[in-house]
Interface confidence: low
C-alpha cells in the first residue's frame, strides 16, 4: 500500500500513524497549495486541526481581510490558520468545532459544535454552526444564525458601527455579538471591564477578557 504523502487535515495525519502534537504541512483540497498548521494529537483522541490560538498577546490580531483569508502568526504560538483554507476544507466533509477557553483564575471550559463550516469568500466566510454542547455556556456565544466575517477593512456586520474597528480583530460579528476570540489581548489584572477584549459572553459575562483560547476542527466521523 502506497504511503500517503499529502494530508488535508490533522485527522489524516493522525490516522497515518503520526500521533505527536506539533506543526505539520497540510494541502488545500483539490490543489497542491500547502499551509502549515498546528495539530493537537492529545486532546480528546487527537486529530485536531488548530485554526486559532491565543495565549500571550504576542501576535497582533487586528489584521486585514487578506491576512485573515491567508492566515497569520506562528502555528507554534498565536495564530490564525486562514479563512480560505478552512472554508475549502469544511466545505468538503462534515467537521466538528471545539473551542477551548482559559480564564485568569485557572478555570477551563469548552464549547463543542457538532457541525461547523465556513461559506466561501463570496459569502464573506459566513459561519455555520449546529449542535452546541460543552461547559462554556448553554447558549452559543457565536451568534446564531451565523454571521459574515468582518475585519478592520471589510465591514460585513449588522451594526451601524464597525464592529471590527470598535472591538478589534476579525470575527463573525453580529451587532456586535456575544463573542470575539480575536479581540485585544489584556494581561491579568487588566482583563475586566474590557469592551474590546477576548470575549465569550456566555461563559465569563460582560467585559471579561480571556487568558487563552484555541479553536480546532476535526472530521465528524473521526
Amino acid at each position: 500500500k502506497e504511503e500517503q504523502t499529502t494530508f488535508r487535515d490533522c485527522a489524516e495525519i493522525f490516522k497515518s500513524g503520526l500521533t505527536t502534537s506539533g506543526i505539520y504541512t497540510l494541502t488545500f483540497p483539490n490543489s497542491t497549495e500547502e499551509i502549515k498548521a498546528y495539530c493537537d494529537m492529545d486532546v480528546g483522541g487527537g486529530g485536531w486541526t488548530v485554526i486559532q490560538h491565543r495565549e500571550d498577546g504576542s501576535v497582533d490580531f487586528q489584521r486585514t481581510w487578506k491576512e485573515y483569508k491567508e492566515g497569520f502568526g506562528s502555528p507554534l504560538g498565536e495564530y490564525w490558520l486562514g479563512n480560505e483554507f478552512v472554508s475549502q476544507l469544511t466545505g468538503q466533509h462534515r467537521y466538528v468545532l471545539k473551542i477551548q477557553l482559559k480564564d485568569w483564575e485557572g478555570n477551563e471550559a469548552h464549547s463543542l459544535y457538532d457541525h461547523f463550516y465556513l461559506a466561501g469568500e463570496e459569502s464573506n466566510y459566513r459561519i455555520h454552526l449546529t449542535g452546541l454542547t460543552g461547559t462554556a455556556g448553554k447558549i452559543s456565544s457565536i451568534s446564531q444564525p451565523g454571521s459574515d466575517f468582518s475585519t478592520k477593512d471589510s465591514d460585513n456586520d449588522k451594526c451601524i458601527c464597525k464592529c471590527s474597528q470598535m472591538l478589534s480583530g476579525g470575527w463573525w460579528f453580529d451587532a456586535c455579538g456575544p463573542s470575539n476570540l480575536n479581540g485585544q489581548y489584556y494581561p491579568q489584572k487588566q482583563n475586566t471591564n474590557k469592551f474590546n477584549g477576548i470575549k465569550w459572553y456566555y461563559w465569563k459575562g460582560s467585559g471579561y477578557s480571556l487568558k487563552a483560547t484555541t479553536m480546532m476542527i476535526r472530521p465528524a466521523d473521526f
Epitope: 451594526c159 455579538g177 456575544p178 469592551f195 459572553y201 460582560s206
Partner: nanobody
C-alpha cells in the same frame, strides 16, 4: 409599560442646530442601549448613533461623525441627540429605539445589541427634522 417619546424636531436652516430628546418611561434607561435612527422620504430607516447601556460608549454613522453628539441624562431618564452643522440631506423623521432584552446586568453593547436596527423592538413615534437650504 415601556415608552419612548421624541421631541425637539423642527425646521432649521442649513448650518443650524437642533437638539432631539428621547424620554423613556417604564424602564431605567441607563442600563439599556438606546439608538437614534432616521428615515427620509422614500428611503430605508438608517442608524445614526447609539449609546450603550452601562458604559455609555457611543457610536456614530460616518455621515454624522463630528456633527452629531449623543448623550444620556440618567436622572431625567432621557437620551439626547445634539445635531450641529445640519445639512439638507439630514432631513428625515428621527426615531429613538431600545432593545427589550436590555441586558440589565451590564452594557448592552457587550451582549451585542448595540446599533443594529434589527435588534430594536421598542420605538418612539418619531420627530420630524427639516433642514432647508
Amino acid at each position: 409599560e415601556v415608552q419612548l417619546v421624541e421631541s425637539g424636531g423642527g425646521l432649521v436652516q442649513s448650518g443650524g442646530s437642533l437638539r432631539l430628546s428621547c424620554a423613556a418611561s417604564g424602564f431605567a434607561l441607563d442600563y439599556y442601549t438606546i439608538g437614534w435612527f432616521r428615515q427620509a422620504p422614500g428611503k430605508e430607516r438608517e442608524g445614526v448613533s447609539c449609546i450603550s447601556g452601562g458604559d455609555t460608549s457611543t457610536y456614530y454613522a460616518d455621515s454624522v461623525k463630528g456633527r452629531f453628539t449623543i448623550s444620556r441624562d440618567n436622572a431625567k431618564n432621557t437620551v439626547y441627540l445634539q445635531m450641529n452643522s445640519l445639512k439638507p440631506e439630514d432631513t428625515a423623521v428621527y426615531y429613538c429605539a431600545t432593545d427589550s432584552a436590555g441586558v440589565p446586568a451590564g452594557p448592552a453593547a457587550v451582549y451585542g445589541s448595540t446599533c443594529s436596527r434589527l435588534e430594536y423592538d421598542y420605538w418612539g413615534q418619531g420627530a420630524q427634522v427639516t433642514v432647508s437650504s
